[in-house]
């Protein structure tokens, strides 16, 4: 797995360099997670044809993966910094159960899956420090998450492969939207 941001050899070799600002650190963290997702998607898509045919292959999707909507204030039209930041943190917290599900779903990229999960936890901490209105952030219920995880893991192999693909695709889209929004803050 790649080295997490801020731990590469260049940082050791150049102690005189300006430390990253909070915004730069968040930006770098998201890009690091996106790189990890890319690697995981590569393994998933090489293993099956689900990446091309997921739309036609499904009649219904009840995964309830977090998604940016107009009302969340993260798009250019109707941009609202505080509302958007709450949405990003809430969405990442909701994704955590799905990232937990992804563990043990990869043969050659097991470390990469763990790195994506751990880096997301760090990203949430960075963002929580940035947020003023922490009370508006709802944390998912652990019992509900445990039940969801059981349901996901009980699915047949085909459904689990499709679920993996959909989680990675949605998480990538969510992070890309978050990155764009955070750059406006």
């Amino acid at each position: 797995a790649p080295v997490p941001p801020g731990e590469d050899s260049k940082d050791v070799a150049a102690p005189h360099r300006q430390p990253l600002t909070s915004s730069e650190r968040i930006d770098k963290q998201i890009r690091y997670i996106l790189d990890g997702i890319s690697a995981l998607r590569k393994e998933t898509c090489n293993k099956s044809n689900m990446c091309e045919s997921s739309k036609e292959a499904l009649a219904e999707n009840n995964l309830n993966l977090p998604k940016m909507a107009e009302k969340d204030g993260c798009f250019q039209s109707g941009f609202n910094e505080e509302t958007c930041l709450v949405k990003i943190i809430t969405g990442l917290l909701e994704f955590e159960v799905y990232l937990e599900y992804l563990q043990n779903r990869f043969e050659s990229s097991e470390e990469q899956a763990r790195a994506v999960q751990m880096s997301t936890k760090v990203l949430i901490q960075f963002l929580q420090k940035k947020a003023k209105n922490l009370d508006a952030i709802t944390t998912p219920d652990p019992t509900t998450n445990a039940s969801l995880l059981t349901k996901l893991q009980a699915q047949n192999q085909w459904l689990q492969d499709m679920t993996t693909h959909l989680i990675l695709r949605s998480f990538k889209e969510f992070l890309q939207s978050s990155l764009r929004a955070l750059r406006q803050m």
């Epitope: 036609e56 292959a57 499904l58 009649a59 219904e60 999707n61 009840n62 995964l63 349901k151 996901l152 009980a154 699915q155 047949n156 085909w158 459904l159 499709m162 679920t163 959909l166």
Partner: nanobody, 124 residues
């Protein structure tokens, strides 16, 4: 495990109707998505219709929309396929299938359980 017994097939004239049934044995029938597939001679098994176990929504292949109706009776552990305005190209073995999960697949590889199939022949 769930056992599926599909029935109701037969020979019918073009323009006629048939009602297929699929009886499921086993627990928690209402948690399963129920799906009808069909396979014509020399062709791949194709999706016909589905009744969601999560949302009670129904879904159809374009080729049967407006002619076929899928319904389920959770009290009787049974799913039905009402087929009207039948055409010779509807001739196939019809299979009932069941799958549990948060996704409802339209492909045969996604199913958990299968019935043995019931033959529908539509003559012109």
């Amino acid at each position: 495990a769930v056992q599926l017994v599909d029935s109701g097939g037969g020979l019918v004239q073009a323009g006629g109707s048939l009602r297929l049934s699929c009886a499921a044995s086993g627990r928690s029938f209402s948690n399963y998505h129920m799906v009808w597939f069909r396979q014509a001679p020399g062709k791949e098994r194709e999706f016909v219709a589905a009744a969601s176990g999560s949302t009670s929504s129904t879904y159809y292949a374009d080729s049967v929309k407006g002619r076929f109706t899928i319904s389920r009776d959770n009290a009787k552990n049974t799913v039905y396929l009402q087929m009207n305005s039948l055409k010779p190209e509807d001739t196939a073995v019809y299979y009932c299938a069941a799958v549990a999960g948060l996704l409802l697949p339209r492909v045969a590889e996604g199913m958990d359980y299968w019935g043995k199939g019931t033959l529908v022949t539509v003559s012109s």
